[in-house]
């Protein structure tokens, strides 16, 4: 806490300029009017203040705006943003995407700090949903942003925003997140067809149901093994050998290298061995020839 001391004669700041870097902390406190600082925040960034001096400037703004800074000030905080605590930021009402961009720029190149996470949370909650422009902005600064959200938070992403998502934005998403994002992508890209559609949907396929995989198998998509290995096991299991062969196209040969890993291992166990043999890959572990496979759903219907 800086002590209240009178401003020395002739030192009263009339504007925010470089002369202030020579002021001691107590002089800044005494001689810089908080209202002046608020109206000239855009100049602060251009002046090489020390961290201690920035602390004083922050303190003056806190006194002027105890309920939280107005957006006109927030937009021009610049490096002073790094001095803010998550508690400070929770008092803000940030509605402009330009303000968000300006503050993210300050933190550019660094990991997402608790301050940035709080800022984004406040901004998204204020908007009510993660619209396309916001998602575009956030993934540009933090490619892993989408995958940092909980499935609950992802629920509020409108399908139209999915157009802003790039494959690398999904690299760190887990299956629970893809479960939420996939149907949104399906809705977003539903009017595309063929190879164009597959390029767009491919990174989301970890959330696809069996029915969509069956449909893709009819479209000559030639899914690569890396994508196939990320599919939900329960979605892959009901696929027939013929469907998997059509789905993978020339990549079907890669099944041999993955035969001990899920979902390939579990899928092999569900197939008749003679069906697997038609692939000519030497896949082993299928249901032996001559064994009867009971359709339990039929048994249930008859009982």
């Amino acid at each position: 806490e800086v002590e209240k001391t009178a401003c020395p004669s002739g030192k009263k700041a009339r504007e925010i300029d470089e002369s202030l870097i020579f002021y001691k902390k107590w002089e800044l406190e005494a001689c810089v009017d908080a209202a002046l600082l608020a109206t000239q925040m855009d100049r602060v960034n251009a002046i090489p203040f020390t961290y201690e001096q920035l602390d004083v400037l922050k303190h003056k703004l806190d006194e002027l705006y105890p309920q939280g800074y107005p957006e006109s000030v927030i937009q021009h905080l610049g490096y002073l943003f790094l001095k803010m605590s998550p508690e400070d930021i929770r008092k803000w009402n940030v509605t402009s995407l330009e303000t968000l961009k300006a503050l993210l720029e300050v933190n550019k190149g660094h990991e997402m700090s608790p301050q940035v996470a709080t800022l984004i949370d406040r901004f998204v909650k204020g908007r009510g949903q993660l619209d396309k422009d916001t998602l575009d902005t956030l993934t540009a600064f933090y490619p892993g942003y989408l995958c940092s959200l909980s499935p609950e938070e992802l629920s509020s992403v409108p399908p139209s925003s999915i157009w802003a998502v790039r494959p690398q934005d999904l690299d760190t998403c887990d299956p629970r997140q893809l479960d939420v994002l996939y149907p949104k992508a399906r809705l977003a890209f539903q009017n595309m067809n063929g190879s164009e559609y597959f390029v767009k949907i491919q990174s989301f396929l970890g959330g696809a149901p069996t029915e969509d995989l069956k449909a893709l198998s009819q479209q000559n998509v030639s899914m690569d093994l890396a994508t196939f290995m990320k599919l939900r096991t329960d979605a892959v299991l009901p696929l027939t050998v013929a469907e998997v062969q059509k789905l993978l196209g020339p990549h079907v040969e890669g099944l041999k290298a993955e035969e001990r890993h899920r979902p390939v291992r579990d899928w092999i166990l569900r197939q008749r061995q003679d069906d697997l043999d038609t692939l000519g890959l030497g896949l082993q572990g299928g249901i032996p020839n001559g064994y009867l496979v009971l359709d339990l759903s039929m048994q249930e219907a008859l009982s």
Epitope: K184, Q219, R232
Partner: antibody
Amino acid sequence: EVKLVESGGGLVQPGGSLSLSCAASGFTFTDYYMSWVRQPPGKALEWLGFIRNKANGYTTEYSASVKGRFTISRDNSQSILYLQMNALRAEDSATYYCTRLEVLYAMDYWGQGTSVTVSS
Amino acid sequence: NIVMTQSPKSMSMSVGERVTLSCKASENVGSYVSWYQQKPEQSPKLLIHGASNRYTGVPDRFTGSGSATDFTLTISSVQAEDLADYYCGQSYSYPYTFGSGTKLEIK
């Protein structure tokens, strides 16, 4: 405007057969999966099965309760969906709805329903 | 078969109140859950698909959320015309299945 209109319901004896029809209009019929759902009086909805679209070869899937007794088919030239019901039982009594499936396999359009009563 | 369990069986609310309906799946169904509204003597209507996506033309007081096994339909401010049965259904794997419904009555 999308419209689905069922017909063919009525009273039938146990063990008997009945064929329901659903006339579709207002959309490209061959692009969509079509489904049948039933609802016994005062009870919940039950999915019976669907028939896939042209791109997926018009193949079918059924629920265990009707597999082997009911058959779903479609006349794409006339945009009509059918449900052929054989070996009917008292528990098949219900209102039968024809539905269109959208991209997430939710039922986005429903017909008005047709009532089937199986009783001696 | 995947069992969809809805709760409560019925509820009575006043106009303007917030309503929360629950639906639990016996297995992970991703986000392949839809919510339907069936008014007395009418066919069901689709409200929400993909767990959280409002269907075209549905008022924004209806919101869906959840994934995997736990799903919720929220009506932020219930209106007299919302008197109906509400069903959840899964379309992740066949046989597709519905819950037994929640009857919403208006006081």
